[in-house]
Interface confidence: low
């Protein structure tokens, strides 16, 4: 199905408008903000989700930048330009003609410039580190149980193949999930690690993007895993280009 046939909704993206106007009266769903048709059997791209989110703006957030080559989404929300396949365009500009280059997850990777700024290619984010701090529990979670549960979550909920979950590290109360996906590894139909990470981030924050599903109730051997802090670091196949002023 393109979408749920009975009531014509998009199970993987509630920020859509759906109607039975597809071929043969099939349910077809379009993302808010962009009007682009989306495939409801898989995750919607982060670019289209951000664009939809900006059609009903909320407060931007700010995250901490950790190190030289790892990027964090410090700039918060913006209304992105997406290509016809729903990916971020390499160059993004705001209404005041300030432009910058982004990576495949839409995070700025250069200083801001003007309309003359060139972004030759969309640089792929091939390594994502999701840093979680869980709320105190009676004791530490069993590492292997936690590892299995998080791998299952990414496979089942986000349809990310287990081979892209490189590692799950745990030192109470910090959990780190490493997602790795090179350009050469990503086959047609594979969920992008950037999209999976974004869905996960929204789930963790209680802002699930899934239609009509309950929020994420993550448990390890029955014990709730309640996250109190999330940081996501992005590493690109080509290091970002910032001026020395920004790095000091």
């Amino acid at each position: 199905h393109t979408a749920a046939q009975d009531n014509c909704t998009c199970p993987t993206n509630k920020m859509t408008v759906c109607s039975p106007d597809g071929p043969g009266g099939r349910c077809q769903c379009r993302a808010l903000g962009s009007g682009m048709a989306v495939d409801c059997s898989t995750l919607t791209s982060k670019c289209l989700l951000l664009k939809a989110r900006m059609s009903a703006p909320k407060n931007a957030r700010t995250l901490v930048r950790p190190s030289e080559h790892a990027l964090v989404d410090n700039d918060g929300l913006y209304d992105p330009d997406c290509d016809p396949e729903g990916r971020f365009k390499a160059r993004q500009c705001n209404q005041t003609s300030v432009c910058w280059c982004v990576n495949s997850v839409g995070v700025r990777r250069t200083d801001k410039g003007d309309l003359s700024l060139r972004c030759d290619e969309l640089v792929r984010t091939h390594h994502i580190l999701i840093d979680l701090r869980h709320r105190p529990t009676a004791g530490a979670f069993n590492h292997s149980d936690l590892d299995a549960e998080l791998r299952r979550l990414f496979r089942e909920r986000y349809r990310l193949h287990p081979k892209f979950v490189a590692a799950v590290h745990y030192e109470q109360p910090t959990i780190q999930i490493e997602l790795r996906q090179n350009t050469s590894q990503k086959a047609a139909g594979d969920v992008d690690i950037g999209d999976a990470a974004y869905y996960f981030e929204r789930d963790i924050k209680g802002e699930s993007l899934f239609q009509g599903r309950g929020g994420l109730d993550l448990r390890v051997r029955g014990e709730p895993l309640q996250v109190e802090r999330t940081l996501i670091y992005y590493l690109d196949e080509i290091p970002p280009k910032f001026s020395m002023k920004r790095l000091t």
Partner: antibody, heavy 119, light 111 residues
């Protein structure tokens, strides 16, 4: 409507390789994984393995080393190969589509094809 | 591997009466708010047909006399009012992890 159809030789000699094809019609095969399941005569169902949309495969460890699942997207076909067969591999073999996003199981099944292992 | 055990192996119920089939998993198949348990119906000479997914969700086109319940390790398939066309073998199956495994099947007949 998605349809799956298994095909292949109905008789295979012991120690040889069983080869089956699953042809999908009425939908894109690139959007879904495909599972293979078998059922010995008069018995229950056994999951053999799956090929995901990425082309990556997962197999039942009980058959590990003997089973290979592959895809030919140009022909809309999936294939199953099971080597070194014995009489215990006699079964109806089914291919089934990995279900839509929120089901996490197999929704559309082929009619199945009986494979007998005998000399 | 998770072992699925169904009970009873066979069941005879009068037309219009309630039929109940149980399935027990050797470890929990519920997590993250979902129960990865599914029920299939198989009639002679036919492939299995998905009836219930994720423990309690009715597959499209399946009559609403079928229902599923349970969580953790214990699950139940209920047919509220048995019809002649419900005679079949019923299987439970989990997708909590790989490999997926099935119960041994329950044969449902008319008394």
């Amino acid at each position: 409507q998605v349809q799956l159809q298994e095909s292949g030789p109905g008789l295979v000699k012991p120690s040889e390789t069983l080869s089956l094809t699953c042809t999908v019609s009425g939908g894109s095969i690139s959007s879904y994984g495909v599972h293979w399941i078998r059922q010995p005569p008069g018995k229950g169902l056994e999951w053999i393995g799956v090929i995901w949309t990425s082309g990556v495969t997962d197999y039942n460890s009980a058959l590990m080393g003997r089973v290979t699942i592959s895809v030919d997207t140009s022909k809309n076909q999936f294939s199953l190969k099971l080597s070194s067969v014995t009489a215990a591999d006699t079964a109806v073999y089914y291919c089934a589509r990995d279900a839509d996003y929120d089901r996490y199981t197999m929704d559309y099944w082929g009619q199945g094809t009986l494979v007998t292992v005998s000399s | 591997d998770i072992v699925m055990t169904q009970s009873p192996d066979s069941l005879a119920v009068s037309l219009g009466e309630r039929a109940t089939i149980n399935c027990r998993a050797s470890k929990s198949v519920s997590t993250s708010g979902y129960s990865y348990m599914h029920w299939y119906q198989q009639k002679p000479g036919q492939p299995p047909k998905l009836l219930i997914y994720l423990a309690s969700n009715l597959e499209s086109g399946v009559p609403d006399r079928f229902s599923g319940s349970g969580s953790g390790t214990d699950f139940t398939l209920t047919i509220s009012s048995l019809q002649a066309e419900d005679v079949a073998v019923y299987y439970c199956q989990h997708s909590r992890e790989l490999p997926y495994t099935f119960g041994q099947g329950t044969k449902l007949e008319i008394k």
